[in-house]
C-alpha cells in the first residue's frame, strides 16, 4: 500500500481542502471511525488500484485516524493497512467528542489504560486531573491517543488552554472491580445455644467487591428458608459479610452450617463450615479428675485448678470449711475463673505463701439456672521436717541414751546412724545405720504425736546404746515428703574423763 502524502502525522489548516491518495495491487479503501467516507476508487491500466479521499472545508472535528486497507473481495490473506493521523487545529473545538463508552473505563485487574482526551492541535499543553483536584497528575500524554498509565479507581478530567480560555474535557470514570482469590471465614456468636435462643453466624470475605453468598444449614434441608443479610463492613475496604440469623433455635437446628462464596469475574469460589449444637437445657460438666486429697507446702504459693465446661456461662464460688472465699485484700488468696474457649473454663484458687491455718476442706461450686456441679478436696499443708532437739545422757544403768525430737507434715521418718572412726567417717567410710538389732547393741524407741492446732506430727525417738568403748558420732536424720534435717552428737565412753 502506498499513501500520499505519507504522513504518518499531518497538520492541516482549518477550512482548507486536502486530498489523500492510497494505491495498491488490490482494491483499496479509506476508513474513518470504522466507516467508509465518500471516496473515488479507480483501477489504472497497469492493474494498480487507487482510492482518493478529498477532505473539504476542514474543521477540528476532522482530527483523527485515517486508515487505508485492502478492500479484497477475492479473500486474499492480508491484514496490511496504513494509518495516517491528521490534526486540524481549530480554536472553536476544545476536546474532541467521545463516544459514551469511552467515558466509562472498566477494569478487573491492575493494567495500563488510556484516558482518551484528544485535542485538535498537537502544540497544545494538556494536563490530567482528578475531577475533585487541581493538581496535574504526572502521566505521559500522547496527542493522538490521550493519557496512558495505571489509574486509580477515580474520576478524571483533562484540561488545556486555547488562547486565553481554559477548557475542560468530559469526566472519565475508571471503575475497578476488586477481585482476588476468595478466602472465606465463618464464625458464630455462639456455637452452643439452648433451644429458644438465637443462632447468628457471619461469613466474611476480604479483597473482593462482587461476591455471591450461599448458605447451607439444617433448616434449609427441611425447606424452611432463612433470608441472610449482606453488608459491607465500615472502614474496611472490600470486606463483605453475610449474616445468617435463626431466631428461637430448635434441637433440629443442630448440625453443619456452610457458607459458600463465589465470584463470577474470575470464577473463584471457597466455602467454610461450622458446627452448631442446640441443647435442650444448659449444662455444667467437670473435665478431668481432681484428687480428694491435695497438698501445699508451708510458706510456698500453691494454685489449685479445676477445669470444667458449661453453657451458659456459670457463676463460680469457692468455699473453705463451708465458708465462702473471696479475693483477700492482703493478697493471701486469689480467685480467678478464665474462659479458655467458648464453653470451657478454668477456675483457680491461689494461696500465696501458704499458712498452716489454710489446711482444711475446700469446695468449688459452678452453677447457673439449669445445672450445677461441685468438687471438694482436703488440703493438707506439708511442713518440712526440723530436728528440734538432739541430746545425749548417761542413766545410772550404765547404758547411754541419745534422744532426738523433730516435727513435720506429713509424718517424718527417723533414721539413726553412727560413725565409729571419727577420722575417716563419714567422708571415707559410710555411717552405720543403727536400729533394733542385738549385734548393734542398740535399742530404739519412737513415739509419734499429732498436734491438731499446728497440724503437724512430732516424733520423739530414743536410742539406747549398751556399751560405748570409744567416741562415737551419732546422727539423727528426719525425713518427709518435703525435706530432711540432720543433727549429730558425739557420744564418749563412761571411762573417758570428758564428754
Amino acid at each position: 500500500l502506498v499513501v500520499t502524502p505519507p504522513g504518518p502525522e499531518l497538520v492541516l489548516n482549518v477550512s482548507s481542502t486536502f486530498v489523500l491518495t492510497c494505491s495498491g495491487s488490490a482494491p483499496v479503501v479509506w476508513e474513518r471511525m470504522s466507516q467508509e467516507p465518500p471516496q473515488e476508487m479507480a483501477k489504472a491500466q497497469d492493474g494498480t488500484f487507487s482510492s482518493v479521499l478529498t477532505l473539504t472545508n476542514l474543521t477540528g472535528l476532522d482530527t483523527g485516524e485515517y486508515f487505508c486497507t485492502h478492500n479484497d473481495s477475492r479473500g486474499l490473506e492480508t491484514d496490511e493497512r496504513k494509518r495516517l493521523y491528521i490534526f486540524v487545529p481549530d480554536p472553536t473545538v476544545g476536546f474532541l467528542p467521545n463516544d459514551a463508552e469511552e467515558l466509562f473505563i472498566f477494569l478487573t485487574e491492575i493494567t495500563e489504560i488510556t484516558i482518551p482526551c484528544r485535542v485538535t492541535d498537537p502544540q497544545l499543553v494538556v494536563t490530567l486531573h482528578e475531577k475533585k483536584g487541581d493538581v496535574a497528575l504526572p502521566v505521559p500524554y500522547d496527542h493522538q491517543r490521550g493519557f496512558s498509565g495505571i489509574f486509580e479507581d477515580r474520576s478524571y478530567i483533562c484540561k488545556t488552554t486555547i488562547g486565553d480560555r481554559e477548557v475542560d474535557s468530559d469526566a472519565y470514570y475508571v471503575y475497578r472491580l476488586q477481585v482476588s482469590s476468595i478466602n472465606v471465614s465463618v464464625n458464630a456468636v455462639q456455637t452452643v445455644v439452648r433451644q429458644g435462643e438465637n443462632i447468628t453466624l457471619m461469613c466474611i470475605v476480604i479483597g473482593n467487591e462482587v461476591v455471591n453468598f450461599e448458605w447451607t444449614y439444617p433448616r434449609k434441608e427441611s425447606g424452611r428458608l432463612v433470608e441472610p443479610v449482606t453488608d459491607f463492613l465500615l472502614d474496611m475496604p472490600y470486606h463483605i459479610r453475610s449474616i445468617l440469623h435463626i431466631p428461637s433455635a430448635e434441637l433440629e437446628d443442630s448440625g453443619t452450617y456452610t457458607c459458600n462464596v463465589t465470584e463470577s469475574v474470575n470464577d473463584h469460589q471457597d466455602e467454610k463450615a461450622i458446627n452448631i449444637t442446640v441443647v435442650e437445657s444448659g449444662y455444667v460438666r467437670l473435665l478431668g479428675e481432681v484428687g480428694t486429697l491435695q497438698f501445699a507446702e508451708l510458706h510456698r504459693s500453691r494454685t489449685l485448678q479445676v477445669v470444667f465446661e458449661a453453657y451458659p456461662p456459670p457463676t463460680v464460688l469457692w468455699f473453705k470449711d463451708n465458708r465462702t472465699l473471696g479475693d483477700s485484700s492482703a493478697g493471701e488468696i486469689a480467685l480467678s475463673t478464665r474462659n479458655v474457649s467458648e464453653t470451657r473454663y478454668v477456675s483457680e484458687l491461689t494461696l500465696v505463701r501458704v499458712k498452716v491455718a489454710e489446711a482444711g476442706h475446700y469446695t468449688m461450686r459452678a452453677f447457673h439456672e439449669d445445672a450445677e456441679v461441685q468438687l471438694s478436696f482436703q488440703l493438707q499443708i506439708n511442713v518440712p521436717v526440723r530436728v528440734l532437739e538432739l541430746s545425749e545422757s548417761h542413766p545410772d544403768s550404765g547404758e547411754q541414751t541419745v534422744r532426738c525430737r523433730g516435727r513435720g507434715m506429713p509424718q517424718p521418718n527417723i533414721i539413726w546412724s553412727a560413725c565409729r572412726d571419727l577420722k575417716r567417717c563419714p567422708r571415707e567410710l559410710p555411717p552405720t545405720l543403727l536400729g533394733n538389732s542385738s549385734e548393734e547393741e542398740s535399742q530404739l524407741e519412737t513415739n509419734v504425736t499429732y498436734w491438731e492446732e499446728e497440724q503437724e506430727f512430732e516424733v520423739v525417738s530414743t536410742l539406747r546404746l549398751q556399751h560405748v568403748d570409744r567416741p562415737l558420732s551419732v546422727r539423727c536424720t528426719l525425713r518427709n515428703a518435703v525435706g530432711q534435717d540432720t543433727q549429730e552428737v558425739i557420744v564418749v565412753p563412761h571411762s573417758l574423763p570428758f564428754k
Epitope: F106, K131, K132, D153, R154, S155, Y173, V174, Y175, L177
Partner: nanobody, 116 residues
Framework: QVQLVQSGAEVKKPGASVKVSCKAS????????MSWVRQAPGQGLEWMGW????????NYAQKFQERVTITRDMSTSTAYMELSSLRSEDTAVYYC?????????WGQGTLVTVSS
C-alpha cells in the same frame, strides 16, 4: 457505606426480555449516575449504558442501542436495566456500578441465562 443490591438470577428463552433491578443505599442516589456492565463467560467487562441520577438522561453503547433500556425510580433509589430480544450470547453476569468520584461501587451481579 455505599451498597448496591441486585435482583436474583434469571433464566429466559431466546426472544424474551429481562429486567434487572439495582437498589442503592448508603449515599444520596441523586448524586451519582448508574452504569450497567456485563461479563459473558470467559470474556471481559462490557459497558452497556448509563443513566444520570439527577435528570434521568441515558447513554447507551452502540452495540446495545436498539435493545437496552435503563430507567430509575428516585422514590426507591432503584435503577433498572431491561434487555430485549434476548439471544444465547446474552448469557452473562450483569452488574450495576456507580462512581463516588474517589472509588467505584458495584452490585453483586445477576446471572442471566438465555436457553431454549
Amino acid at each position: 457505606q455505599v451498597q448496591l443490591v441486585q435482583s436474583g438470577a434469571e433464566v429466559k428463552k431466546p426472544g424474551a426480555s429481562v429486567k434487572v433491578s439495582c437498589k442503592a443505599s448508603g449515599y444520596t442516589f441523586i448524586s451519582h449516575g448508574m452504569s450497567w456492565v456485563r461479563q459473558a463467560p470467559g470474556q471481559g467487562l462490557e459497558w452497556m449504558g448509563w443513566i444520570s441520577a439527577d435528570n434521568g438522561n441515558t447513554n447507551y453503547a452502540q452495540k446495545f442501542q436498539e435493545r437496552v433500556t435503563i430507567t430509575r425510580d428516585m422514590s426507591t433509589s432503584t435503577a433498572y436495566m431491561e434487555l430485549s430480544s434476548l439471544r444465547s450470547e446474552d448469557t452473562a453476569v450483569y452488574y450495576c456500578a456507580t462512581h463516588g468520584g474517589d472509588r467505584s461501587y458495584w452490585g453483586q451481579g445477576t446471572l442471566v441465562t438465555v436457553s431454549s
